[in-house]
Structure formats: C-alpha cells, structure tokens
C-alpha cells in the first residue's frame, strides 16, 4: 500500500520528488538511507524532522526554495555521503546565518549549483569537509577565487566551476587542494591563464571563456599529469604552448582565433615568437621535461572553426599517436601529409569546409586513416591515386568538391579524374554535388561500398557498368536530383541493396525486380511516374518496407499493385492520404480513395467522387 | 505477520518506576518507527512519543518528555517504555504500535494501575 | 501543538446507513491525517492513513477525504461490527496528536 502515499519508497530509498511538499515528512521509515526531496517548495531545512534520519548517506533537497538552513541542520546526518543543495535560494542571508552547512565529516560529494552564490558568501557557507571528493559550484555569481575559497578539502579531487562570472583566480587558490584531479571552469569570463601549475591535475575544462592566451609556469622539473584539456571557443591566436604536458591525450582548440605559423621560428628553441604566430608548436620540449617529445601521446585534437591557413610540415611530425584530427571550418587550401609514417595512427581526418585545392596524400602516409571528410571544400584536380594510396579508408565524403571519378581499370577516363577502383577498404563515399557529368564503366571495380551517394549531380550520365563490381555488396544507393530520364543501371542484380533513393529525376519506369530482394525503402518523389506494374514491383512485397511516391503523376487507374498496397499491403506508403493519382479526364483525387469500380474499361470515369 | 505483543497488566506503587515491553515480529524492526500511546480512563488517546529502532533516537510528546525514556533492544526486536515517579495520573491502558505514515499495527496495550 | 477537534463526541445510527465523522485541525496538515478504530474490548486498528488511503483489510465501506484542516472520514453502510470510538490523528509536525474521538452507537 506504499505506492499510496506521496513518497515512493523502495528498500531504504525514499522518492519524495514533486509533490509540492512545504517541509520535510516526519513519517518516513527511520532507516531512510537515501532521500530525494527535489522538485518541492522546501524553503527551510531544519535539525527537526530531518535530523530524524541519521541513517541518510544521499540526500537530495536540490530545486528548491531553502533559503535558510538551521544551524546544525544536518549535524545529526553523521552517514551523509552525498548532499545536493542544487537550485536553491542559498545567496539568500538567512541561509548562512550561524555558519552555513556546518561540518560535514563524511561527505564526499557537494552539489551547491545554481544559488546564485557569490564570492565571499561561499567561504561563509563552506564548513570543515575532510571527506569531500566532488564539489558542484556551477552556475552561480562567482567573480573571484582566493586562497580562503577552498580550505579544510584536503581531498577534494572534482571542482565544477562552469557558467559563473570568474574573472580572476589568486595565485595558490587551488594550493589546499593536492588531491585536486577533475576542474571544471567553463563559461566564465577568463581572458588569461599564465601561469598553470596544477601538476596534479588531470582534467581541465576551460571551454566558452575569453582566453587569448594559455600558459604554463616555467617549472623545468615539473611532471603535469594533464591529460584531458578543453579550450574551445576562446580567443586564442595561437596554438598554445604545450610542451610542458606531455601526458596529454585529448585537446579541444576549436572555435578560437589560431593561425598557425607559416615558416620556422625566428627564435632558435622555437617557442617564442608570436608575432610570428608562434606560441610554442609542438616542436621541442623544454629541458627536463620527462617525454622529450611533446603531444606525443595525444589521442584527439580538434582544430575546428579556426583560421588555419596552412598546416606545417613539422607540426604533424610528432603526433604520432594521434587518433582523431579535426581541421573543418578553418581558411586550409593545401593539405599535405606525404612523409612515410605521417600520422601513422590517425583513424579520422576531417577537412571538411575549408577551401582546399589541392590534397597530397604520400603512398604510405596515413596507414590507419578510416574516416576522410573533404565535404564543402574546392578539389578538383587530384592525383588519380589520391585515395587508392590509403590501405584502410572505409568511408570518404566529397560533397561539394569538383571531383571527376575516373573509369574502370580499361577507361581510365580524362586527366585530372580520380580513381575510385581498387579501393579494397572502402565502404562508405559521397560523391554529392560535385558537377559529374559522366560516371564511367568500372568507376567502382574492386571497391566493395556499402554506400554510395551520387546525388546533386544534374545531367549525369551514368555509363552501362558504371556501378559494375558493386552487385554484391550495395546496401545504399542514392541518386536523388540528377535530372535522369533512364537509368542504365539493373537493380534487380543488387541482391543486398536496402535502400534506394531515386527521388527528383524524371524517370517513369522501373527495372522488373521479378525474384526476392532485399530492398526496404525506396524513395520515388518527385519523378514523372504513372503507373507502377505489379509485374515490376513484384519481387519487392517481401522486403519493401517503405515507398515514397508524392510528386508524381500518377494514374488513377492501373495501378491495381499500388492500390492494393494501400488497403492492405505491408509496404507503408508515406503520406498515403496525400497521394494524388490522376483519372483520364484529368481529374485528380486521392489514390486512397480509388475503388475498382472506379476505373471502367477504356480508363473512362463517369462517376464523381 | 506483524505481531507486536504486550505482558498482561501491571500494578506499581506510587513513586515507583515501571518498564513495559513490545516485541515485535514478523517485519524489518529497523524500518518502522515505534510509537507509544496512552488510554486513560474514560479519556481518548494520546500520543506519548516514538523511537527509531535503527538509531535509538527518540521524539517525546512535551507532556511525557520528563517521565518517560524510550529505548530499544535492536537484536531481540524489542522496544521499552519506562516510566519514573509513577502517580495515580499514570494508570492507564498503554499501547506500543508500529508505523510511518500511519500506526498500521498495535499492541493489545498493557494496563499499568498505580496503587498503594 | 497542533489540535485535533472532533465536535461530535457520540453519534446514533441504523444498520444500513451513511454515517459521516469529521475532524478538524489547528492548522494545515497538508493531508497527513489518520483514522483509527477502537473497538470496546480496547483493541485499536488504523482504518485510514494520508486522508483517504485504505489501509490493507480494512473494508471499502470506509472511505475519507479532506484537505488543509477539514478532514471527515465516511462509512457508507453501517454493520454491526462498526460500534466502536473513531480517532482522527495528524502526523504532519511532532508532537502527532489525536482528537477526542466519536463514539458511534447503533439505534
């Protein structure tokens, strides 16, 4: 009879979410370990009743109204574990009257987001917290941190800061905290790190800031444990000066201002000259430093929305465990990476939306590269190997360049083409708007894809065989917007196809597909269909699952497979009640709404609908 | 089932103290709390405090609060009442019963009389 | 101390009929109120927890409703079996305290 009450209970946790609840219930069970308040109209917490469950390790009193906290109100919690405070009204006076929260000996995670607290007011209302691992202070007024902020966690180890208003951080204000592993300062109002010491420090989050400039103290002995580092969207110029993390294993750069240097360093160590654009490219570690070689354990940079002109030949040279590069959104026109072993681990590249002429990949570069994104860039002529060189590429994107495929191995097709035969790895290329005019015999010989999207490409003509070699692997073909009037493909041969587009051309007949495929969805809108056979459509009842037809002219009458499709059929036709089909004497009415008798012979109607 | 079972009555001198025991059975003792009420004669009820089995932590009605302690023995799932400088004004019916949100099981109640 | 008022001390009724007892709070009890039994061998049994929850066995003849500081609690065919005194209780702020109670009487 529990689930009666307000509060669910279950074991020894108790629900009390949402119930409009003014103060805490006194007929709880007395072993209550965890307690979940939130969501109520809470606006006091006193020592009476909540003191009544001493057994409580989690207690959540988070999206409230408390703006007063009795003295000792949660002194008889001595197992509390977990305590949030989250969406309140703590900034409130009579909330830190008589010495805020008061020690918390067992707690280990604090959750005080959303008080609108402000500088000053925290260190009255932090208490003694031996215990304490994970404290929340996001999303209040914070302007500043000083040395009093944050004393009596000596093992404190996450710090959530994100969305105040911290502009400034004192020299040592993080020094009560050797244990401190996990800082969150995102969306403040930073404009300078200078001076970063934190060595212990693993994780640092300094996103959505107005840093122009990241730093590190000059410690040549120091070992910093940083291995996570996000400075995206800040003011960054330059790419900051890393050599003194060599742990790093994630980087986030994007959405600054970087321009990377576009000859050597005037100064001899090459970390200092940023009028040239140079702040310390991953070049030369200082003396000291324990790795010698730094970001050379750097998993994932990400370089997006910057204004990269040009990528140095040495800056590649030591991120040699780099898995994932994303370079979209940047001013790039060239790309090279010919050195044999360049980016020997890298998975994905992404250059998508640059401006790139020109791609020169070296034959035995990039030797663990799946993933290519190229889509809304400029190339055009390529060396005809340009992809072929890469022994593991599973899927490339081209859309939005001017690349010409060349032919099979018999039709290499004009200069300038690119070859897209013999590429045993490839399962995935988008070749969408890329003005083709021709898709030659054997484009794809030797190529197992899985997916292939030729659409955007008005007035291609595909050859005889252009998809020959692909009979047995295609799963998704799309060809939509191409203007073609035929298609010189059999897709009856394309025994694993699943989904194909056709949409917003000009065909109005199909190939027969007389024997079981394995198609699902297939997408006509926007042809010049009248009538689609059951002789054709046949093979398809068993595997079609979906079947866009709107924007064709289709027949009223003739079309016993559709309609019969409509009533009772499994294929879903999408946006059945719109489908518009056409009577002999010009009269359209709903397809749906066609019956047999409708259709006399001849074709003729005399019957109003 | 739930059973929480009293000792037959009690006869004390004035002055004098007494301890009513509750056993209970049949429930997780630590996950209710214990209540205690009084029936005096011809009188209604009235709610004299309540322990947690789990802590020892106990509530008083102010009226009963110098009177009366309330303890618990967690391993044989036992509660006590003791009364101290028992008066005529004491002698009544009195009832252990278990309950959060409501007293959902009662003891029969054991009749104390104060008498010299 | 929050009081409890049962302005009708005792109430006569047939077998068969609707019998309302209503109890009435100091202050607001946001719906922690209680209904009690007490038979006239003394034994004592909850009816009715949270205002209107039917605590388990207890037949569906009794039924309460209420809210703020108005509560009643209603039998809606009287038997035999329902002669006894009926105590409303709040459990909303310590001390919980009872009404005086409603003896019900068959006519």
């Known amino acids: 009879h529990q689930d009666k009450v307000p509060c669910k209970m279950v074991d020894k946790k108790v629900s009390c979410q949402v119930l409009g609840l003014l103060q805490v219930p006194s007929v709880l069970p007395p072993d209550t370990e965890t307690l979940d308040l939130s969501g109520n109209q809470l606006r006091s917490i006193l020592a009476s009743p909540l003191g009544f469950y001493t057994a409580l390790r989690h207690l959540d009193l988070s999206t409230n109204e408390i703006s007063f906290l009795q003295p000792g109100a949660f002194q008889a919690l001595t197992h509390l574990e977990h305590l949030s405070l989250a969406h309140n009204r703590l900034a409130m006076a009579t909330a830190l009257s008589a010495g805020g929260l008061g020690p918390l000996p067992r707690v280990t995670s604090l959750d005080l987001s959303g008080n609108s607290l402000y500088s000053g007011l925290l260190e009255r209302l932090l208490g003694e917290a031996p215990s304490l691992h994970t404290l929340s202070l996001a999303e209040n007024s914070l302007t500043r941190l000083t040395r009093h902020t944050f004393r009596d966690m000596p093992a404190l180890e996450q710090l959530d800061l994100h969305s105040n208003v911290l502009m400034d951080i004192e020299d040592g204000a993080f020094e009560g905290l050797p244990r401190l592993t996990h800082l969150n300062l995102s969306r403040n109002s930073l404009t300078c790190i200078s001076d970063f010491s934190l060595q212990q420090l693993r994780v640092l989050d300094l996103s959505c800031n107005s840093i122009e400039a990241f730093q590190t103290a000059s410690q040549p002995q120091a070992e910093f444990q940083l291995t996570w580092l996000d400075l995206r969207e800040n003011k960054l110029l330059h790419f900051p000066d890393l050599a003194a993390l060599p742990r790093l294993i994630y980087l986030n750069l994007s959405n600054n201002l970087i321009r990377l240097p576009t000859g050597p360093p005037q100064d001899s160590k090459g970390i200092h000259a940023p009028s040239e654009g140079w702040s310390a490219l991953p070049l030369s570690a200082p003396s000291g430093n324990a790795s010698g070689r730094p970001l050379s354990q750097l998993l994932n940079l990400d370089l997006s929305y910057n204004e990269i002109e040009l990528i140095p030949d040495s800056f590649l040279e030591h991120l040699t465990s780099l898995c994932f590069l994303n370079l979209s959104r940047n001013c790039l026109r060239t790309f090279e990476a010919r050195r044999l072993g360049s980016l020997p681990c890298l998975m994905l590249l992404d250059l998508s939306h640059n401006a790139l002429e020109t791609l020169e990949l070296g034959a035995r570069a990039l030797g663990s590269l799946r993933t290519l994104l190229l889509q809304g860039n400029a190339l055009r002529d390529l060396p005809p190997y340009t992809f072929a060189n890469l022994a593991s590429l599973q899927r490339l994107n081209l859309q939005g360049n001017r690349v010409s495929p060349c032919g099979g191995p018999d039709e290499p097709g004009p200069s300038g083409c690119v070859a897209f035969s013999g590429i045993t790895s490839l399962r995935s290329l988008s070749l969408v708007d890329n003005e083709i005019e021709l898709l030659r015999a054997g484009a794809f010989l030797h190529t197992p894809l899985t997916e292939l999207d030729l659409s955007s490409n008005p007035g291609l003509e595909v050859a005889t065989g252009a998809l020959g070699g692909l009979e047995a692997s295609l799963e998704v073909l799309a060809l939509q917007g191409n203007g073609l009037m035929v298609l010189q493909v059999d897709l009856p041969c394309f025994i694993c196809l699943k989904r194909l587009n056709l949409a917003e051309n000009r065909l109005s007949h199909l190939p027969a597909w007389t024997q079981a495929v394995s198609l699902e969805v297939l997408d006509l809108r926007n042809n010049s269909f009248s009538l689609l056979p059951g002789s054709a459509m046949g093979g398809l009842e068993t595997s079609l699952r979906r079947l866009y037809l709107q924007g064709n002219p289709l027949s009223c009458c003739g079309n016993g497979w559709l309609a019969a499709q409509l009533h009772q059929g499994r294929v879903d036709v999408d946006a059945t009640q719109d489908l518009i089909c056409r009577f002999s004497s010009q009269e359209e009415v709903s397809l749906s709404h066609v019956r047999p008798e409708d259709c006399e012979k001849g074709g003729l109607k005399n019957i109003n609908l | 089932q739930v059973q929480l079972q009293q000792p037959g009555p009690e006869l004390v001198k004035p002055g004098a103290s007494v301890k009513l025991t509750c056993k209970a059975s049949?429930?997780?003792?630590?996950?209710?709390?214990m209540h205690w009420v009084k029936r005096g004669p011809g009188r209604g009820l009235e709610w004299i405090g309540r322990?947690?089995?789990?802590?020892?932590?106990?509530h008083y009605h102010e009226k009963f609060k110098t009177k009366v302690t309330l303890t618990v023995d967690k391993p044989s799932s036992t509660a006590y009442m003791e009364f101290s400088s028992l008066t005529s004004e004491d002698s009544a019916v009195y009832y252990c019963a278990r309950g959060n949100y409501g007293m959902d099981y009662w003891g029969q109640g054991t009749a104390v009389t104060v008498s010299s | 101390d929050i009081q409890m008022t049962q302005t009708t001390s005792s109430l006569s009724a047939s077998l068969g009929d609707r019998v309302t007892i209503s109890c009435r709070a100091s202050?607001?009890?946001?719906?922690?109120l209680n209904w009690y039994q007490q038979k006239p061998d003394g034994t004592v049994e909850l009816l009715i927890y949270y205002t209107s929850t039917l605590h388990s066995g207890v037949p569906s003849r009794f039924s309460g409703s209420g809210s703020g500081t108005d509560y009643s609690l209603t039998i809606s065919n009287l038997e035999q079996e329902d002669i006894a005194t009926y105590f409303c209780q709040q459990v909303n702020t310590l001390p919980f305290t009872f009404g005086s109670g409603t003896k019900l009487e068959i006519i």
């Open positions: 202050q607001d009890i946001s719906n922690y």
């Open positions: 049949g429930y997780i003792f630590t996950s209710y709390w």
């Open positions: 322990i947690a089995p789990n802590s020892g932590g106990a």
